[in-house]
């Protein structure tokens, strides 16, 4: 197993519809093929995968059909894209990335980019 | 090294606009946020919101919701925070600051806003 | 909004003495997102603890925080004369993040 960088901005406000997006950029020092990208959420020193995908370069990233993730990629750049996002989801979201094929096989795991988000103002009753 | 640079003193009559300005360097601003504190004399330090110069998403304190904008530069790196219809109690040394998730690491030297007639 | 309290306002003491600050959250805050900033007559604040109890860059080792939860201290050991100061805690758990009112520690 061979270390890789792989960088992510630190801080990330989530939308006021609880999506937020970044990109996660690796070093890659060969040329992949395969690919797979995890999301890591750290809070309160637990950590929890929140989805993972494999791709072929230059094809779609595929994430399981009830995934709150969905991504692109371009090079060695992986833009992801969290939705359903509420308050209590706030964290520090890890960027994992495995270059699977051709060997060697590569692991770059980023710092992590903080994730705020805010529950939206509940709408005033309105009168009818 | 890291830094942040705030524009200089402003005095301004009750009702008016003001709008300081915040150039960062020394790292990736799009990396982190730039959160705004003031501080009226003699007082403490009250958050005013942030803004992610990642991707522009603003939070704003309750208080000031409606009278404060919050925006950025990323070609110069520089953040922006707006007052609109000031009053005396607006008057506050107003300082920008990194957010970072986890402590606001870096801050500017401070900018005086004097609200009066 | 979470709510931090300081106490006590004032703390009076002489250098050399040990200074116990506390700061408390209306609910929990996770360790990760609680600070202290030291600040002085016409200076802007200085990180000095971020994440409960890591000093920040620069940070003299006399400086240390401990808590969790509710419950957050930070101790001067051996208070210096530039020590003499107004302390924050503040937490960025939750939007929007708040400050404590401060604590100012005076010479005695």
């Known amino acids: 197993c061979k270390a890789m960088h792989v960088a992510q901005p630190a801080v990330v406000l989530a939308s006021s519809r609880g999506i937020a997006s970044f990109v996660c950029e690796y070093a890659s020092p060969g040329k992949a093929t395969e690919v797979r990208v995890t999301v890591l959420r750290q809070a309160d020193s637990q950590v929890t995968e929140v989805c993972a995908a494999t791709y072929m370069m230059g094809n779609e990233l595929t994430f399981l059909d009830d995934s709150i993730c969905t991504g692109t990629s371009s090079g060695n750049q992986v833009n992801l894209t969290i939705q359903g996002l509420r308050a209590m989801d706030t964290g520090l979201y890890i960027c994992k990335v495995e270059l699977m094929y051709p060997p060697p096989y590569y692991l770059g795991i980023g710092n992590g980019t903080q994730i705020y988000v805010i529950d939206p103002e509940p709408c005033p009753d309105s009168d009818f | 090294q890291v830094q942040l640079v705030q524009s200089g003193a402003e005095v301004k009559k009750p009702g008016a606009s003001v709008k300081v300005s915040c150039k960062a360097s020394g790292y990736t601003f799009t990396s982190y946020g730039i959160g705004w504190v003031r501080q009226a004399p003699g007082q403490g330090l009250e958050w005013m919101g942030w803004i992610s110069a990642y991707n522009g998403n603003t939070n704003y304190a309750q208080k000031l919701q409606g009278r404060v904008t919050m925006t950025t530069d990323t070609s110069t790196s520089t953040a922006y925070m707006e007052l609109r219809s000031l009053r005396s109690d607006d008057t506050a040394v107003y300082y920008c600051?990194?957010?970072?998730?986890?402590?606001?690491?870096?801050w500017g030297q401070g900018t005086t806003v004097t609200v009066s007639s | 909004e979470i709510v931090m309290t300081q106490s006590p306002a004032t703390l009076s003491l002489s250098p050399g003495e040990r200074a116990t600050l506390s700061c408390r959250a209306s609910q929990s805050v996770s360790s990760s997102y609680l600070s202290w900033y030291q600040q002085k007559p016409g200076q802007a604040p200085r990180l000095l603890i971020y994440?409960?109890?890591t000093r920040a860059t620069g940070i003299p080792a006399r400086f240390s925080g401990s808590g969790s939860g509710t419950d957050f201290t930070l101790t001067i050991s051996s208070l210096q004369p530039e020590d003499f100061a107004v302390y924050y805690c503040q937490q960025d758990y939750n939007l929007p993040f708040t400050f404590g009112p401060g604590t100012k520690v005076d010479i005695k």
């Open positions: 994440g409960a109890s």
């Open positions: 600051a990194r957010v970072r998730g986890g402590g606001l690491d870096v």
